[in-house]
Interface confidence: low
């Protein structure tokens, strides 16, 4: 006759508090005659978890009908898991005997361990904006997970980043853990619409990673380019000079016209044109009464963008 | 003879993973003769934790020397605690008998539960500044603690706040918990130097609460007050008008002088005077050539503070 095997297919079973755990056990033979019991632990202090014949086990149910004659599946379900339930569970075959049954063979055991899902990752950007070609740091945090093994990846617009540093705390044993990662991202002029993503994979997530995002629009400042040009005018004694302010982000912009160094007009940009890349353009013009000037006039367009130091562009207007 | 009492003084023992737990048990009598054993749980499935006479219990040590004749202390220490150790522990007296000892009396039991310290609270303020008399929200977060019971208090400059809402997640059983609290703080003009503190008390902290702080200087905007006055001048054909910009915060300020509505000069505040309450003062002056004017002149001091809409104060200069 074939020798009885006790098959417990899972070496490790990860469960979360409050859920139901299924412990699998199948036998390869109906012989010898005798019951299958479940224990936690080994040795004289082992704890009886389920005995079909006697005892009261309110949280345990069987997967199959153990009263069926040729049942070979002795798997059980334990409901409302608590931290007190962790340990190694053995399904054990007894041989019918007199005056009492005798232990015959034990399964290899399934270790039940507690898992806890990581919290949704929170991504934070820098406190102050930076300009293209500069490097900014983003942080990602997630808490409350167990076990400690976890994978964290950073992406910018779907491309994986490599310049980051990650810590999992605490270093020693704990009931749960936290992860903290800092990624360094080099900004480019086209990053107004860009996104960074922090992606966390953990055994409790069953293959569906958690993601946290941040928009680079909160972190970037694209300074404007200025161009001052003279437009043709019908009226002889007037000159129309325009200042084209291009490709800036964020919106906040103040423009001052100076004539030979004296303030002529100050205005705040309002109706802006948005470019495809998320930056803005704006145009301002100045009408100069040429008859009020004997000599050539230097016109300066001075722009203060997002509270930064002003930049300017000048134009020499010839008075003929 | 005095009846034997089994004293287990702690009803609940809170332990952290990796540490050593001490389970106290004392007896009031040496009689009847027989050993004291430790079990986890009750009934036929209870687990033997310690038996002085037989078995191997590598993580268990006794507090007292059990070999001493009149020892009455049967307390034990369990090292390297893991989540699998939680449960209710009973010290049980057996009466010596033949062929085996008979259970005589059990202690009331000590429940061992897992504790985990909360992480350092992180306090975040509002994304945009607000002005005095307005209400701003601050959030406080801490993670990874167990058990769920926790106390969170808010303080502003040492005074306890009452307008806040706190959530502890998850609502059900978990291996660890997170707390999130939002406090509403009414700003006053003197709050530039103020601080809000989030204080967390938890049983694992042994009486030293954790604190997170935030400065209201990051959350407040104190708009300036303007005063335009004429100063006495020696020269007959000149008038000196000053604009006193008082009690503003933060620093960023741009001032424009207008003569009869036309821009005369724009300047950015640089050398500021700091007041005791953390706000700033600044003064700007304008020299007006009165001989260039036939009629009275309206001088306007226009101030744009911290990117907000400009405020202005006018002064009518009489040309005699």
């Amino acid at each position: 006759e074939e020798e009885l095997q006790m098959i417990q297919p899972e070496k490790l079973l990860l469960v979360t508090v409050g859920k139901t755990a299924t412990l699998h056990c199948t036998v390869t033979s109906l012989l010898p005659v005798g019951p299958v019991l479940w224990f936690r632990g080994v040795g004289p202090g082992r704890e009886l978890i389920y005995n079909q014949k006697e005892g009261h086990f309110p949280r345990v149910t069987t997967v199959s009908d153990l009263t069926k004659r040729n049942n070979m599946d002795f798997s059980i379900r334990i409901s409302s898991i608590t931290p007190a339930d962790v340990g190694t569970y053995y399904c054990v075959k007894f041989r019918k005997g007199s005056p009492e049954n005798v232990e015959f063979k034990s399964g290899p055991g399934t270790e039940m361990a507690l898992g806890a899902k990581p919290s949704a990752p929170v991504v934070s950007g820098p406190a102050v904006r930076a300009t293209p070609e500069h490097t900014v740091s983003f942080t990602c945090e997630s808490h409350g997970f167990s076990p400690r093994d976890i994978t964290l990846k950073w992406f910018k617009n779907g491309n994986e980043l490599s310049d980051f540093q990650t810590n999992v705390d605490p270093a020693g044993d704990s009931v749960s853990y936290s992860i903290h990662s800092t990624a360094r991202v080099v900004l480019t002029r086209g990053d107004v619409h860009s996104q960074v993503i922090c992606e966390i994979a953990h055994i409790t997530l069953q293959g569906d990673p958690l993601r946290g995002t941040a928009n680079l629009s909160e972190a970037i400042r694209v300074p404007p380019t200025l161009e001052v040009t003279q437009q043709p005018m019908r009226a002889e004694n007037q000159a129309n000079v325009t200042c084209q302010v291009s490709n800036f982000y964020p919106r906040g912009l103040q423009l001052t016209w100076l004539e030979n160094g004296n303030v002529s007009r100050t205005e705040t940009a309002s109706t802006l044109i948005e470019n495809k890349d998320g930056t803005y353009n704006w145009m301002s013009w100045l009408l100069v009464n040429t008859c009020a000037h004997r000599d050539d006039v230097v016109l300066t367009c001075q722009v203060e963008h997002d509270g930064q130091q002003a930049v300017s562009k000048s134009y020499a207007l010839e008075i003929s | 003879e005095e009846e034997l009492q089994m004293i287990q003084p702690e009803k609940l023992l809170l332990v952290t993973v990796g540490k050593t737990a001490t389970l106290h048990c004392t007896v009031t009598s040496l009689l009847p003769v027989g050993p004291v054993l430790w079990f986890r749980g009750v009934g036929p499935g209870r687990e033997l934790i310690y038996n002085q006479k037989e078995g191997h219990f590598p993580r268990v040590t006794t507090v007292s020397d059990l070999t001493k004749r009149n020892n009455m202390d049967f307390s034990i220490r369990i090292s390297s605690i893991t989540p699998a150790d939680v449960g209710t522990y009973y010290c049980v007296k057996f009466r010596k008998g033949s062929p085996e000892n008979v259970e005589f009396k059990s202690g009331p039991g000590t429940e061992m539960a897992l504790g985990a310290k909360p992480s350092a609270p992180v306090v975040s303020g509002p994304a945009v500044r607000a002005t005095p008399e307005h209400t701003v929200s601050f959030t406080c977060e801490s993670h990874g603690f167990s058990p769920r019971d926790i106390t969170l208090k808010w303080f502003k400059n040492g005074n306890e706040l009452s307008d806040f809402q706190t959530n502890v997640d998850p609502a059900g059983d978990s291996v660890s918990y997170s707390i999130h609290s939002t406090a509403r703080v009414v700003l006053t003009r003197g709050d530039v130097h103020s601080q809000v503190i989030c204080e967390i008390a938890h049983i694992t902290l042994q009486g030293d609460p954790l604190r997170g702080t935030a400065n209201l200087s990051e959350a407040i905007r104190v708009p300036p007050t303007l005063e335009v006055t004429q100063q006495p001048m020696r020269a007959e054909n000149q008038a000196n008008v000053t604009c006193q910009v008082s009690n503003f915060y933060p620093r960023g300020l741009q001032l424009t002088w207008l003569e009869n509505g036309n821009v005369s000069r724009t300047e950015t505040a640089s050398t500021l005077i700091e007041n005791k309450d953390g706000t700033y003062n600044w003064m700007s002056w304008l020299l007006v050539n009165t001989c260039a004017h036939r009629d009275d002149v309206v001088l306007t001091c226009q101030v744009e503070h911290d990117g907000q809409q400009a405020v202005s104060k006018s002064y009518a200069l009489e040309i005699s």
Partner: antibody, heavy 122, light 107 residues
Framework: EVQFQQSGTVLARPGTSVKMSCKAS????????MHWVKQGPGQGLQWIGA????????TYNQKFKGKAELTVVTSTSTAYMEVSSLTNEDSAVYYC???????????????WGQGTLVTVSA | DIQMTQSPSSLSASLGERVSLTCRAS??????LNWLQQEPDGTIKRLIY???SLDSGVPKRFSGSRSGSDYSLTISGLESEDFVDYYC?????????FGGGTKLEIN
């Protein structure tokens, strides 16, 4: 670091009163009961009483009721004890210490002030 | 009130020796007992809380234990700075009471 700074040595006449202070720094004052303890010359320690700054709740050792009065000023994180109708028996060093507002074992009498010496003499 | 009877009131010992001080409680105080150390200049420091828990920064040669209503402070391997005064203190019920103290002197 948590510290308690107590006021300096006092020489007082019989029948008068003395008021001593204990200023806490390094932690939130309002989270704790502030306790006072007496030590007579060459003698042991005696618990006088305690005050909870949040609501000025006080608890006294019966032996010191009417003799000692405990107060606090939360804005300065300072606890005060006034000892009245002084006699030679009141000559002692007085200590302040604290316990947490939860009854947590680890938080009882961890930190102590350096003591204030009161000498009562005609 | 709970009486705390501390013994001995004074004790002479040599460097490196192991000594035990005892406090007996007149009523049940569970594990709610502290051991305090007082320097000659009056400075008070807590060594042990909850009968047997060692305060951080306190050398491992100090330990606390309990047998019934008897609470012990043991110093294994006396060092020169240990020859000072020691008090037990119960905080199970108000009024909180101290033992009479033990003066530890060098032989």
């Amino acid at each position: 670091e948590v510290q308690f700074q107590q006021s300096g040595t006092v020489l007082a006449r019989p029948g008068t009163s003395v008021k001593m202070s204990c200023k806490a720094s390094g932690s939130t004052f309002t989270s704790y009961w502030m306790h006072w303890v007496k030590q007579g010359p060459g003698q042991g320690l005696q618990w006088i009483g305690a005050i909870y700054p949040v609501n000025n709740d006080t608890t006294y050792n019966q032996k010191f009721k009417g003799k000692a009065e405990l107060t606090v000023v939360t804005s300065t994180s300072t606890a005060y004890m006034e000892v009245s109708s002084l006699t030679n028996e009141d000559s002692a060093v007085y200590y302040c210490t604290r316990s947490f507002y939860y009854s947590l074992d680890a938080a009882w009498f961890v930190y102590w002030g350096q003591g204030t010496l009161v000498t009562v003499s005609a | 009130d709970i009486q705390m009877t501390q013994s001995p009131s004074s004790l002479s010992a040599s460097l490196g020796e192991r000594v035990s001080l005892t406090c007996r409680a007149s009523q049940d105080i569970g594990s709610r007992l502290n051991w305090l150390q007082q320097e000659p200049d009056g400075t008070i420091k807590r060594l042990i809380y909850a009968t047997s828990s060692l305060d951080s920064g306190v050398p491992k040669r100090f330990s606390g234990s309990r047998s019934g209503s008897d609470y012990s402070l043991t110093i294994s391997g006396l060092e020169s700075e240990d020859f000072v005064d020691y008090y037990c203190l119960q905080y199970a019920s108000s009024p909180f009471t101290f033992g009479g103290g033990t003066k530890l002197e060098i032989n």
